[in-house]
């Protein structure tokens, strides 16, 4: 069974998948469609790296540009380094500028909805 066939079988169970499962799935060559990706739990999507999302979505990663204003895509973009976003070839903007440190302060993030940044 190839990755795409496997994805079709598990698609209906993915809604509540934790980050760890999504990371594992990204190694399976599944080419998740964007509609399914956007139904995933936001808290499960946010920790994924650009490389992991690229592997998870495969060719459908191109659709992030079309859906950049919608959650969880918008929130995920804000968490990524701009350098990493640039590798997607989509002209996505809003990532963390080069040279900034991301502090994972859970309380700060819970209050503001965005990560805390320290300038260079």
């Amino acid at each position: 069974m190839n990755g795409s066939e496997y994805f079709v079988k598990i698609q209906s169970f993915l809604g509540g998948a934790p980050t760890e499962d999504l990371k594992a799935l990204s190694q399976q060559n599944v080419s998740m469609d964007l509609a399914t990706f956007m139904k995933l739990r936001t808290d499960a999507v946010l920790p994924l790296t650009v490389a992991e999302v690229q592997k998870l979505l495969g060719p459908h990663v191109e659709g992030l540009k079309a859906e950049e204003r919608h959650r969880p895509v918008r929130d995920w973009i804000l968490r990524q380094r701009q350098d990493d976003l640039d590798t997607l070839g989509l002209g996505l903007q809003g990532g963390i500028p080069n040279g900034y440190l991301v502090l994972d302060l859970s309380m700060q993030e819970a209050l503001s909805g965005t990560p805390c940044l320290l300038g260079p």
Epitope: K39, L88, L90, G91
Partner: antibody, heavy 117, light 113 residues
Framework: EVQLVQSGAEVKKPGASVKVSCKAS????????MHWVRQAPGQGLEWMGN????????YYNERFMSRVTMTVDKSTSTAYMELSSLRSEDTAVYYC??????????WGQGTLVTVSS | DIVMTQTPLSLSVTPGQPASISCKSS????????????LAWYQQKPGQSPTLLVY???TRESGVPDRFSGSGSGTDFTLKISRVEAEDVGVYYC?????????FGGGTKVEIK
């Protein structure tokens, strides 16, 4: 103004390979994916695959998986599509098309590839 | 693969009259989160490359005359030309970009009576 200028018509023998080029101008080449679509004479459109011009990652329609290679040259803002083991059914006009998000917003003028012995 | 079925195959229209083209997909093209339908319409005039008319099922591409309109959701979509003009002659294609391989309808040829 966005422009996609493709290479000229080609005549190839069965079993040979063809490489079609698509030179882009009028926009930032690495910010938009490039797709390739073909159209056999008098027929409809068939999506062949797409490529991320920033990383060079490409994705192909399984129908062409073993025969197609898509590449880019960022220094010249040019995309390439190579199709090998040509057969008569590959006679078609091959188009490059720049993505607008997912949809195909700009198309090249097309390159006619004729496969004939 | 998602199958796209277009009807009619061809259409002969009197100038100034409306025209309607149907496109049905074998599975939903709706993103239920964003409410976007992943469907585009293209026009291909004789001897030319295709051009984009509509994306997200109903968003008209800039520069496209407002006599063209797209509608529909899920699996059933329609392209309407409110008043056909001589320059509208050509073949019209729908395309899904929900899941690869992205597939096109078979095309609808529009002719002038």
């Amino acid at each position: 103004e966005v422009q996609l200028v493709q290479s000229g018509a080609e005549v190839k023998k069965p079993g040979a390979s063809v490489k079609v080029s698509c030179k882009a101008s009028g926009y930032t080449f690495t910010n938009y994916w490039m797709h390739w679509v073909r159209q056999a004479p008098g027929q409809g459109l068939e999506w062949m695959g797409n490529i991320n011009p920033s990383s060079g990652d490409s994705y192909y329609n399984e129908r062409f998986m073993s025969r197609v290679t898509m590449t880019v040259d960022k220094s010249t803002s040019t995309a390439y599509m190579e199709l090998s083991s040509l057969r008569s059914e590959d006679t078609a006009v091959y188009y490059c098309a720049r993505s607008g998000g997912l949809w195909l917003a700009f198309w090249g003028q097309g390159t006619l590839v004729t496969v004939s012995s | 693969d998602i199958v796209m079925t277009q009807t009619p195959l061809s259409l002969s229209v009197t100038p100034g009259q409306p025209a309607s083209i149907s496109c049905k997909s074998s599975q939903t093209l709706l993103n239920s989160v964003s409410q976007n339908n992943y469907l585009a319409w293209y026009q291909q005039k004789p001897g030319q490359s295709p051009t984009l008319l509509v994306y997200f099922a109903s968003t008209r591409e800039s520069g496209v005359p407002d006599r063209f309109s797209g509608s529909g959701s899920g699996t059933d979509f329609t392209l309407k030309i409110s008043r056909v003009e001589a320059e509208d002659v050509g073949v019209y294609y729908c395309q899904q970009h929900y899941r690869t391989p992205y597939t096109f309808g078979g095309g609808t040829k529009v002719e002038i009576k």
